[in-house]
Amino acid sequence: VPLSRTVRCTCISISNQPVNPRSLEKLEIIPASQFCPRVEIIATMKKKGEKRCLNPESKAIKNLLKAVSKERSKRSP
């Protein structure tokens, strides 16, 4: 569950469930910082613009990140 705020982390709960890359509008990877000591991954879905916080430690999510970056590298000239 994402919450917006200035300081502190954004994700309140995280999901281990993989997301279909085709249903993704946007995938944000927020590196650890002085505001939040952990990496946060926020997926925005095409349907309704729903947001989901993903577990960076989950194998399924790591595979998703690989798939997305592979897709991006294919698209870039």
Partner: antibody
């Protein structure tokens, strides 16, 4: 099955302290934000506090800020509510509830049975 | 802080009738962040609707939610005996507190 069981309620004098516990089972507790919600006798629901899945984020209702502390022990699958400087108006049934972990906000999808706190002299 | 108002306070209906419950917010709430709960005497609340219009797991299709902005509605198309209870709306905005409405009691006429 997915379950939350609260304990620690009882009768306590005004100004004293009490610690509530909520034991979770049947789901990945360490992935889930957790809430405390209370209900005074004959009244509606009042959100009390929220803690993020890893304990970094804590939020409180104004009515309990500075007096109550929410915490968790993911190794024990347990949520806590430390209640200090208790007042008569804190008398209520206290529920712990799970913040739906899949996706954006889907509500509090799992609730405990509640534990009763009575503040009286 | 967003304040939620529910109306009516009590709704007296017979089994088989349609129930329409209203929840109004003091300021706009993203429909992604509006939920409805049912509570029966002596029991914990139960999540019915999330995201203003999506039914939670195991909730019968006679329950439906709608609305956006400041006005939201919970509709029970045909009341069953087990539907007589108190219903609460709740908002979960971009920051706490995550307020509940005062509730609507649906009782038997």
């Amino acid at each position: 099955q997915v379950q939350l069981v609260e304990s620690g309620g009882g009768v306590v004098q005004p100004g004293r302290s009490l610690r509530l516990s909520c034991a979770a089972s049947g789901f990945t507790f360490s992935n889930s934000g957790m809430h405390w919600v209370r209900q005074a006798p004959g009244k509606g629901l009042e959100w009390v506090a929220l803690i993020g899945f890893d304990g970094i984020n804590e939020y409180y209702a104004d009515s309990v800020k500075g007096r109550f502390t929410i915490s968790r022990d993911n190794s024990k699958n347990t949520l806590y509510l430390q209640m200090n400087s208790l007042r008569a108006e804190d008398t209520a049934v206290y529920y712990c509830a799970r913040d739906w972990p899949e996706g954006y906000y889907n509500g509090m999808d799992v609730w405990g049975q509640g534990t009763t706190v009575t503040v009286s002299s | 802080e967003i304040v939620l108002t529910q109306s009516p306070g009590t709704l007296s209906l017979s089994p088989g009738e349609r129930a329409t419950l209203s929840c109004r917010a003091s300021q706009s709430v993203s429909s992604s962040y509006l939920a409805w709960y049912q509570q029966k005497p002596g029991q914990a609340p139960r999540l019915l609707i999330y995201g203003a219009s999506s039914r939670a797991t195991g909730i019968p299709d006679r329950f439906s939610g709608s609305g956006s902005g400041t006005d939201f509605t919970l509709t029970i198309s045909r009341l069953e005996p087990e539907d007589f209870a108190v219903y609460y709306c709740q908002q979960y905005g971009s920051s706490p507190p995550f307020t509940f409405g005062p509730g609507t009691k649906v009782d038997i006429k």
